[in-house]
Interface confidence: low
C-alpha cells in the first residue's frame, strides 16, 4: 500500500533517503530525447536477504530517434502522481560507509537517465531533513520522518526541525547531526511512493563528519 502523502514539508529544508528498504522500487525514466527500450524494465527493485541487498533489473533507454541504440536510464508507471524525488549515490570506491542490513544504496548512474528519480517507498523507510543554504537548524527532536503503518493506514511521522535565520557565510547548511529516532524502525512493509531533493546529512549510513571551515563562491 502506497503512503498516502509525501513526507511533511519543512520550510527552508529538504529531505532525502540515505538508503532504501528492501521492496523499494525505482522507476525507469529517460531524459528528453530518449525513451525506455521496449523490452526494458519498468523499474528497479531493492531485493535481498538479511546479509545482502541489491537492486534487481537494470534501467535502459534508447534514443527516441533510433530504434537499436541502447542507453541506460529510469522507469515511470503511468498512473503515478507527480511527487518529489530523492537523489543518492552508489559506491564505486566506498569510503568507510557502512551498509545498512535490509537496505540498498542508491543505484549506480546510467547514461541519459532522467534528472529526477522517483521511488516507491515501503513502510519503515526513513527520510532525513536538513536546512538549505542560508538557514540554521534548530532541533527540537529527530530531524527525520518515517513512513509508518497505523491502524491500516500509512502516515509519515513529523520531523522536529526548524530552519531559521541566516548562517555565517563560512559555515555549511545544517551542520547539526540529526538525532537517532526511536521510532525509525520498520513495522510492516507496504509501499510508499516518495521522492526527495538532495542535501547533506550525517547518519548511521555516513561516516562521522568533522566540522571544517571552507569558503564558497561563484566562478
Amino acid at each position: 500500500e502506497l503512503c498516502d502523502d509525501d513526507p511533511p514539508e519543512i520550510p527552508h529544508a529538504t529531505f532525502k533517503a540515505m538508503a532504501y528498504k528492501e521492496g523499494t522500487m525505482l522507476n525507469c525514466e529517460c531524459k528528453r530525447g530518449f525513451r525506455r527500450i521496449k523490452s526494458g524494465s519498468l523499474y528497479m527493485l531493492c531485493t535481498g536477504n538479511s546479509s545482502h541487498s541489491s537492486w534487481d533489473n537494470q534501467c535502459q533507454c534508447t534514443s527516441s530517434a533510433t530504434r537499436n541504440t541502447t542507453k541506460q536510464v529510469t522507469p515511470q508507471p503511468e498512473e503515478q502522481k507527480e511527487r518529489k524525488t530523492t537523489e543518492m549515490q552508489s559506491p564505486m570506491q566506498p569510503v568507510d560507509q557502512a551498509s545498512l542490513p535490509g537496505h540498498c544504496r542508491e543505484p549506480p548512474p546510467w547514461e541519459n537517465e532522467a534528472t529526477e528519480r522517483i521511488y516507491h517507498f515501503v513502510v519503515g523507510q526513513m527520510v532525513y531533513y536538513q536546512c538549505v543554504q542560508g538557514y540554521r537548524a534548530l532541533h527540537r527532536g529527530p530531524a527525520e520522518s518515517v513512513c509508518k503503518m497505523t491502524h491500516g493506514k500509512t502516515r509519515w511521522t513529523q520531523p522536529q526541525l526548524i530552519c531559521t535565520g541566516e548562517m555565517e557565510t563560512s559555515q555549511f547548511p545544517g551542520e547539526e547531526k540529526p538525532q537517532a529516532s526511536p521510532e525509525g524502525r520498520p513495522e510492516s512493509e507496504t509501499s510508499c511512493l516518495v521522492t526527495t531533493t538532495d542535501f547533506q546529512i550525517q547518519t548511521e549510513m555516513a561516516a562521522t563528519m568533522e566540522t571544517s571551515i571552507f569558503t564558497t563562491e561563484y566562478q
Epitope: 569510503v95 568507510d96 521522492t195 531533493t197 538532495d198 547533506q200
Partner: nanobody, 134 residues
Framework: EVQLLESGGGLVQPGGSLRLSCAAS????????IGWFRQAPGKEREGVLS????????YYADSVKGRFTISRDNPKNTVYLQLNSLRPEDTAVYYC???????????????????????????WGQGTQVTVSS
C-alpha cells in the same frame, strides 16, 4: 561501467603549477557535483575543492584558496583542478569524486551545495600522484 579517471599529476618544484583532469565515463557529469580530495602519506584524505554542476558554485578548503581553482567542461565530461603556487605540503595523491545532485524541487533548495566531506561522495577515481619537491 562507471569510472572516474584522474590524470595530470607529476613532480613539480615549489611555486610551480599543474593541471589535473578528472574524466568521467559511463555517466554524464551534468547532474553531479565533483569534489577533489587529497591524501598525503600518513594522513587522512581531506577535501580540497568541489564544484556544483547546477550553478558552478565552488567550495574551497582554506588551505588552497587563492592557489587552486576548479572548473568543469560538461561537453567533455571532465573536471579540472588547476594547482598554482604549489608547496611541499601539497604533496599527496589527488582524487576526484562525484556526487549526484537532486533536481532542487523546493524553491528554497536552489543553493543547496556539496561541501567537502568524504562521506558525501560515493564515486571515486583511483587518484594521481602530485609531488612538490626541489
Amino acid at each position: 561501467e562507471v569510472q572516474l579517471l584522474e590524470s595530470g599529476g607529476g613532480l613539480v618544484q615549489p611555486g610551480g603549477s599543474l593541471r589535473l583532469s578528472c574524466a568521467a565515463s559511463g555517466f554524464t557529469l551534468d547532474y553531479y557535483a565533483i569534489g577533489w580530495f587529497r591524501q598525503a602519506p600518513g594522513k587522512e584524505r581531506e577535501g580540497v575543492l568541489s564544484i556544483s554542476s547546477t550553478d558552478g558554485r565552488t567550495y574551497y578548503a582554506d588551505s588552497v584558496k587563492g592557489r587552486f581553482t576548479i572548473s568543469r567542461d560538461n561537453p567533455k565530461n571532465t573536471v579540472y583542478l588547476q594547482l598554482n603556487s604549489l608547496r611541499p605540503e601539497d604533496t599527496a595523491v589527488y582524487y576526484c569524486a562525484a556526487k549526484r545532485l537532486g533536481p532542487m524541487v523546493h524553491q528554497y533548495s536552489l543553493e543547496v551545495l556539496t561541501p567537502l566531506f568524504l562521506d558525501e561522495y560515493d564515486y571515486w577515481g583511483q587518484g594521481t600522484q602530485v609531488t612538490v619537491s626541489s
